[in-house]
């Protein structure tokens, strides 16, 4: 079982390989000096049907380096960064993992593209392994809450409350969504 020639790349090179390309072979992509690699640099020859070989993912691309590009902080609800830090410049990558009791959908890594957006795939999502969710928490008078998403919230996530200036927060500042689908505390109040 073998794979066909690896997908070509413009403005870059492919690591050396011999033919036939055996299942298990890794080929690596790199870009010319003034270009930045967007996407996974390593492709693996695999077989899904034990008959034909295929590459496990699409080839990355080489984008002409844009020194003015910068990408915003990428947020994955239920997840956290395991690699990457600000500032995010063209070609920088960020890799995510999911919190306990969450599983990942999509690709764990994304790259800062010349268009100031993360790609070449969407940000991954972290899905709760528990079917239960906590109901949306109310806003409070003279205060705000920072929820990672709107509406019902998956267990493991939290909401942080804060008060407007001149008001004092009474109660719990951070409320966690429990695996039971219940909140760990009642919303606080903001008092003068």
């Amino acid at each position: 079982i073998s794979c066909g020639s690896p997908p070509p790349i413009l403005n870059g090179r492919i690591s050396y390989y011999s033919t036939p390309i055996a299942v298990g072979t890794v080929i690596r992509y790199s870009c010319s000096g003034t270009f930045r690699l967007i996407g996974e640099k390593s492709l693996l020859c695999i077989t899904k049907d034990k008959v034909d070989g295929t590459w496990d993912k699409p080839a990355p691309k080489c984008e002409y380096f844009n020194k003015y590009s910068s990408c915003p902080e990428p947020i994955v609800p239920g997840g956290y960064k395991i690699r990457g830090s600000t500032p995010y410049r063209h070609g920088d990558s960020v890799t995510f993992a999911c919190k306990t009791n969450f599983s990942m959908n999509g690709n764990k890594s994304v790259w800062c593209q010349a268009n100031n957006m993360w790609g070449p795939t969407r940000l991954p999502t972290c899905v709760s392994v528990f079917p239960l969710e906590c109901p949306a928490l109310p806003m409070i008078h003279n205060g705000h809450h920072t929820s990672e998403n709107v509406g019902s919230i998956a267990p493991g996530l939290s909401v942080t409350y804060s008060c407007e200036s001149g008001y004092l927060l009474v109660g719990e500042k951070i409320i966690n969504c429990l695996s039971s689908g219940k909140w760990s505390a009642v919303p606080p109040t903001c008092e003068e």
Epitope: Y16, S18, G24, R28, S30, S42
Partner: antibody, heavy 119, light 106 residues
Framework: QVQLVQSGAEVKKPGSSVKVSCKAS????????ISWVRQAPGQGLEWMGR????????NYAQKFQGRVTITADKSTSTAYMELSSLRSEDTAVYYC????????????WGQGTLVTVSS | EIVMTQSPATLSVSPGERATLSCRAG??????LAWYQQKPGQAPRLLIY???SRATGIPARFSGSGSGTEFTLTISSLQSEDFAVYYC????????FGQGTKLEIK
């Protein structure tokens, strides 16, 4: 960090086989590749082959083709290296080493297993 | 197999001084090169990957450079714990190691 714990030292007769194990703990066994690298006394490092456990795909250095078999048991997060038709020049410390995904370099190494081939 | 050649075989340097170790690939390997440190009776330890990226927890005195066929590992100010054997490894086409450079106290 992933910990790799290898089986104990072995003394073997020429012509026999040896099977060394490498148990991984921490991380996800399915998200990395395990290579076997050997080091003869006072010598350098020599790559023997590697397996990607999630796919069950093993590849071998030409020098060892037909004499080495690398397998993995996902249920116990353990990789194995079996070397057959042993000769005295196979006396070495055998290491398992882990590469994250298919990065190409080894972040973590086992403690090594000394295999002595002697009549 | 891509042949990796390290030089010198042995390097004698005084503590506090700079050490420069070389590694040459038999063919172009882009930046697909790693450096390892090995002390007697221990497994190798990853220092540098992708020719110039320091591995987690590796002190800043270790740096790597080069691409194509010529690579260098530099230790800016040698500490007593740095005296060991150093290996380069390519991962352009499968995997192969250099024969090692022994860094000893002068």
């Amino acid at each position: 960090q992933v910990q790799l714990v290898q089986s104990g030292a072995e003394v073997k007769k020429p012509g026999s086989s040896v099977k060394v194990s490498c148990k991984a703990s921490g991380g996800t066994f399915s998200s990395y590749a395990i290579s076997w690298v050997r080091q003869a006394p006072g010598q350098g490092l020599e790559w023997m082959g590697r397996i990607i456990p999630i796919l069950g795909i093993a590849n071998y250095a030409q020098k060892f083709q037909g004499r080495v078999t690398i397998t993995a048991d996902k249920s116990t997060s353990t990789a194995y290296m079996e070397l057959s038709s042993l000769r005295s020049e196979d006396t070495a410390v055998y290491y398992c080493a882990r590469e994250e995904d298919i990065s190409g370099y080894y972040q973590d190494w086992g403690q090594g297993t000394l295999v002595t081939v002697s009549s | 197999e891509i042949v990796m050649t390290q030089s010198p075989a042995t390097l004698s340097v005084s503590p506090g001084e700079r050490a420069t170790l070389s590694c040459r690939a038999g063919q172009k390997i882009s930046s697909y090169l790693a450096w390892y440190q090995q002390k007697p009776g221990q497994a190798p330890r990853l220092l540098i990957y992708d020719a110039s990226s320091r591995a987690t927890g590796i002190p800043a005195r270790f740096s790597g450079s080069g691409s194509g066929t010529e690579f260098t590992l530099t230790i800016s100010s040698l500490q007593s714990e740095d005296f060991a054997v150093y290996y380069c490894q390519q991962y352009e086409y499968w995997y192969s190691f250099g024969q090692g450079t022994k860094l000893e106290i002068k």
